[in-house]
């Protein structure tokens, strides 16, 4: 199946991180995963360097492997937790969500 | 091994391009490979998401693949080629050489 | 921009052959593979053959052992050969040509219009 965008929701809980966040228990984080192989097309947003590295593995496998399916785009999330000195805070957290895939 | 930056040359005779492009015969692309496995270490340049889905697959390897290792940094080649009307035009391509990899 | 103008679509009995023809034009330059995809109404397009500038084919599992994908870089057309045609091979088929992104990040696909291949039994 080629490079695509799968569902992941993370809990909080199962990283062992709720005792330091507070909201949200978990989130959609989404991952990235599908192959990067000859021939690619305009939905699997190959990078240039990506196009070349699929063409080198596919003439001969040997020398290098496929490019990977990896994020594109991500997106921040909202992280309302305690601090070393037990205050509220609220951040955002950048790169947390997938938004697109790609062949890089 | 970690992910990391490896040696490739890429001739362009190789790829079939020698009749359009002029110059240079091929370009030190480089591609990236290895591991992004737990514990990440700063040298691995892991996203957010990337450190996320790291624990998430560490915890149960099912659910996800480990992040994969990519180019976080890529630069330009200027190539002399001839165009569709036969001239000779000196052209930048983006993102066709790996200046640094992380995982993804 | 690349144009790309597909022929030698058709009706043909099951068991006969047709050859498809590609010819591309524009900024050809930078084309890295060519193929023929193909699609029925109400399922996705998918991969019958491509070939890349150096002459590496890859075939999709319908295409294998029966249709040969070549090109004539002096053309600019691509082949798709096709024999032992069976009526589940009736499809509008597509020629794909893939290049290098610029100045995008991205690699860009141009389609022809399609031809239409219809295998009677």
């Known amino acids: 199946q080629a490079c695509k965008k799968h569902e992941l929701y993370v809990s909080f809980r199962d990283l062992g991180w709720q005792d330091w966040i507070i909201a949200p228990e978990g989130y959609a984080a989404y991952y990235c995963e599908g192959e990067c192989a000859f021939p690619l097309n305009s939905y699997m947003n190959a990078t240039n360097h990506a196009i070349v590295q699929t063409l080198v593995h596919f003439i001969n496998p040997e020398t290098v492997p496929k490019p990977c399916c990896a994020p594109t785009q991500l997106n921040a999330i909202s992280v309302l937790y305690f601090d070393d000195s037990s205050n509220v805070i609220l951040k955002k957290y950048r790169n947390m969500v997938v938004r697109a895939c790609g062949c890089h | 091994q970690a992910c990391k930056k490896h040696e490739l040359y890429v001739s362009f005779r190789d790829l079939g391009w020698q009749d359009w492009i002029i110059a240079p015969e091929g370009y030190a692309a480089y591609y990236c490979e290895g591991e992004c496995a737990f514990p990440l270490n700063s040298y691995m340049n892991a996203t957010n998401h990337a450190i996320v889905q790291t624990l998430v697959h560490f915890i149960n390897p099912e659910t996800v693949p480990k992040p994969c290792c990519a180019p976080t940094q890529l630069n330009a080649i200027s190539v002399l080629y001839f165009d569709d009307s036969s001239n000779v035009i000196l052209k930048k391509y983006r993102n066709m050489v790996v200046r640094a990899c992380g995982c993804h | 921009e690349v144009q790309l103008v597909e022929s030698g679509g058709g009706l043909v009995q099951a068991g006969g052959s047709l050859r498809l023809s590609c010819a591309a034009s524009?900024?050809?330059?930078?084309?890295?593979?060519m193929g023929w995809y193909r699609q029925v109404p109400g399922k996705q397009r998918e991969l019958v053959a491509a070939?890349?500038?150096?002459?590496?084919?890859n075939y999709g599992d319908s295409a294998k052992g029966r249709f040969t994908i070549s090109r004539d870089n002096a053309k600019n057309t691509v082949y798709l050969q096709m024999n032992s045609l069976k009526p589940e091979d009736t499809a509008v088929y597509y020629c794909?040509?893939?290049?290098?992104?610029?100045?995008?990040?991205?690699?860009?696909?141009?389609w022809g219009k399609g031809t239409l291949v219809t295998v009677s039994s």
């Open positions: 794909n040509s893939y290049g290098l992104g610029y100045p995008g990040d991205y690699g860009i696909d141009y």
């Open positions: 524009g900024s050809i330059f930078s084309i890295v593979s």
């Open positions: 070939i890349t500038s150096a002459g590496s084919t």
